[in-house]
């Protein structure tokens, strides 16, 4: 159930159409989870500052049941910062990503939970 959320001050017009599909496929590969369980949410046009500057930036979160940990998170950071730089022109040093290892019982889906 990986769920990736990007809040950014980059305008909607600057988010390419292929971005959501690409994020989905890349996260599926990186987490080893099926693409049909990957959810991505890009929230553009936000009023944001990073280090006191309103240059392009992003505040992100990746929730997953397992597949979260020190080495894995470093790998995800490299992948996701790369995509945010390449597609949204956000410098990697203006990105924060919070990682959440979810308990299956605390994630609802399809009238139940993953527990």
């Amino acid at each position: 159930m990986p769920m990736f959320i990007v809040n950014t001050n980059v305008p909607r017009a600057s988010v390419p159409d292929g971005f959501l599909s690409e994020l989905t496929q890349q996260l599926a590969q990186a987490t080893g989870k099926p693409p049909q369980y990957i959810a991505v949410h890009v929230v553009p046009d936000q009023l944001m500052a990073f280090g006191g500057s309103s240059e392009p930036c992003a505040l992100c979160s990746l929730h997953s049941i397992g597949k979260i940990g020190g080495a894995q998170n470093r790998s995800y950071s490299k992948l996701l910062c790369g995509l945010l730089a390449e597609r949204l022109r956000i410098s990697p040093d203006r990105v924060y990503i919070n990682y959440y290892d979810m308990n299956a019982a605390n994630v609802g889906w399809n009238n139940s939970t993953f527990a």
Epitope: P16, G18, Q25, E86, R89
Partner: antibody
């Protein structure tokens, strides 16, 4: 008006060097990622080099065919980008275009210069 | 490297006709595709980006479609100013390769 203007082309012998310049105006140059693209009858349109903005550490990238021979650089204070070419070969002959994106609208090559012609021949 | 295969290489059509140019990528490039028009002796001009979004000032007689590996550019009701060469280009990753071009000529 958004404008890019290339200069520095001409005739050069194989093995020689040449420096192309591109002057930009009408947009926030410091935010833009800049590119060189060339065109020849033999190879068609071919991306050559890329230089990112200061926010992205002026990172540079090159086509495999020019790596180690060409160097892209920029001077944000002069709103200019350069392409230093060395060890030139006949296959480097073509029209060299400076291109970029109109920052904040799309990330594609929507701004092009008129091009400058480079001929590598003895 | 991703290869972009454009077809046809050349096309002859009359004013008022509708034509379609296709572009195939050697691997999935999502919607990271642009189309350019180039007139003789001029630099390329952006027509379409993100496979289907018309660039500023481009008339609605042009339309782009496709995603993944198969893309097309359709021009309806051809006008004299539409004749020239057309190129596709992917923006998925370096090198940003172009198609070989389609030369559109007046019949």
């Amino acid at each position: 008006e958004v404008k890019l203007e290339e200069s520095g082309g001409g005739l050069v012998q194989p093995g020689g060097s040449m420096k192309l310049s591109c002057a930009a105006s009408g947009f926030t140059f410091g935010d833009a990622w800049m590119y060189w693209v060339r065109q020849s009858p033999e190879k068609g349109l071919e991306w050559v080099a890329e230089i990112r903005s200061k926010a992205h550490n002026h990172a540079t990238y090159y086509a495999e065919s020019v790596k180690g021979r060409f160097t892209i650089s920029r001077d944000d204070s002069k709103s200019s980008v350069y392409l230093q070419m060395s060890s030139l070969r006949a296959e480097d002959t073509g029209i060299y275009y400076c291109t970029s994106h109109h920052y904040g609208s799309s990330w594609y090559f929507d701004v092009w210069g008129a091009g400058t012609t480079v001929t590598v021949s003895s | 490297d991703i290869q972009m295969t454009q077809s046809p290489a050349s096309l002859s059509a009359s004013v008022g006709e509708t034509v379609t140019i296709t572009c195939r990528a050697s691997e999935n490039i999502y919607s990271y595709l642009t189309w350019f028009q180039q007139k003789q002796g001029k630099s390329p001009q952006l027509l379409v980006y993100d496979a289907k979004t018309l660039a500023e000032g481009v008339p609605s007689s042009f339309s782009g479609s496709g995603s993944g590996t198969q893309f097309s550019l359709k021009i309806i009701s051809l006008q004299p100013e539409h004749f020239g060469s057309y190129y596709c280009q992917h923006h998925y990753g370096r090198p940003y390769t172009f198609g070989g071009g389609t030369k559109l000529e007046i019949k």
